[in-house]
């Protein structure tokens, strides 16, 4: 009942080419520590698409301010969509480990697709 | 282990509105949608709409849309339905209802409340 | 909508012998996750629904095994193994692969 929980409400968006998609994620508790990672696809060969942590991700925003204390919301929102964004984008909880962090719980995944832009 | 209360029943006139509580107690209430479910006499289950309060916002059945306002208060674990516009065809029973389907895919809809009897009559 | 489809609308059985329902969706439940969003729940006479199957085929905390669901993309069923008396009420299978909708429901009645 306590243990963190990712929740991904939506199991499918659908976005006309051109917009912005959201993408809801939240935690249901601050405890274990570690980053936040978005990813598209599952497995070995999944794309990382956002990185709490580090990197530079020009097309993602977070909706709310992941530098708030106590903030439990890593919804993310993709600008300019286009079909090649098309795919399953799961939220992944890592819990702070050394050297690496480790995967500690993943969202169910939220299928994005992407419609042609209305004429 | 998690109950949900759901406040008394109602006698409402037609165009009025109605607004039921849903109070959960004995567990985690945040990040469980609520959903809510109602039943008219004889009939089957018309799911309305549903809120987790983590996040705040609705969503709501079309057929609902417009009529129907889904909140949460997290400080009382509370969730309210209000039904607006009533009409005869709204007299049922409506129920709350603990629905893991919105994040937890451990669960479907795995906690109901007692439900609320809603009369619309002139 | 996706729109839930139950058969039969009636069912009268015979006490220890099996039932079946059956649940049609107008899409598929079946989610790139590999889970079918589809939930089958008992609503007794005058009491609350419950539930008894998530995800297609995972019996609920507290239901017995002669319950079990199986099924996958829009074509699912709900077994009862022996049937046994308190098992009376209306089943409803629903879909929460997108805002959730209920079937008809079945009423198992005792023959």
């Known amino acids: 009942e306590d243990e963190l929980q990712v929740i991904q409400p939506e199991k499918s968006v659908s976005v006309a080419a051109g917009e912005s998609a959201t993408l809801r994620c939240a935690m249901t508790s601050l405890i274990p520590v570690g980053p936040i990672m978005w990813f598209r696809g599952a497995g070995a060969g999944r794309e990382l698409i956002y990185n709490q942590k580090e990197g530079h991700f020009p097309r993602v925003t977070t909706v709310s301010e992941l530098t708030k204390r106590n903030n439990l919301d890593f919804s993310i929102s993709i600008s300019n969509i286009t079909p090649a964004d098309a795919g399953t984008y799961y939220c992944v909880k890592f819990r702070k480990g050394s050297p690496d962090d480790v995967e500690f719980k993943s969202g169910a995944g939220t299928e994005l697709s992407v419609r042609a832009k209305p004429s | 282990q998690v109950q949900l209360v759901q406040s008394g029943a109602e006698v409402k006139k037609p165009g009025s509105s109605v607004k039921v509580s849903c109070k959960a107690s004995g567990g985690t209430f945040s990040s469980y949608a609520i959903s809510w479910v109602r039943q008219a006499p004889g009939q089957g289950l018309e799911w309305m709409g549903g809120?987790?309060?983590?996040?705040?916002?609705?969503n709501y059945a079309q057929k609902f849309q417009g009529r129907v306002t889904i909140t949460a208060d997290e400080s009382t674990s509370t969730a309210y339905m209000e039904l607006s516009s009533l009409r005869s065809e709204d007299t049922a029973v409506y129920y709350c209802?603990?629905?893991?389907?919105?994040?937890?895919?451990?669960?479907?809809?795995?906690?109901w409340g007692q439900g609320t009897t809603v009369t619309v009559s002139s | 909508d996706i729109v839930m489809t139950q058969s039969p609308l009636s069912l009268p059985v015979t006490p220890g012998e099996p039932a079946s329902i059956s649940c049609r969706s107008s899409?598929?439940?079946?989610?790139?996750?590999?889970?079918?969003?589809l939930d089958w729940y008992l609503q007794k006479p005058g009491q609350s629904p419950q539930l008894l199957i998530y995800l297609g085929s995972n019996r609920a905390s507290g239901v017995p095994d002669r319950f079990s669901g199986s099924g996958s993309g829009t074509d699912f069923t709900l077994k009862i193994s022996r049937v046994e008396a308190e098992d009376v009420g209306v089943y409803y299978c629903?879909?929460?692969?997108?805002?959730?909708?209920f079937g008809g429901g079945t009423k198992v009645e005792i023959k």
């Open positions: 209802a603990r629905d893991g389907s919105a994040g937890r895919q451990e669960h479907g809809m795995d906690v």
């Open positions: 629903m879909q929460a692969r997108g805002l959730p909708t």
């Open positions: 809120i987790i309060p983590i996040f705040g916002t609705a």
């Open positions: 899409q598929s439940l079946l989610h790139s996750n590999g889970y079918n969003y």
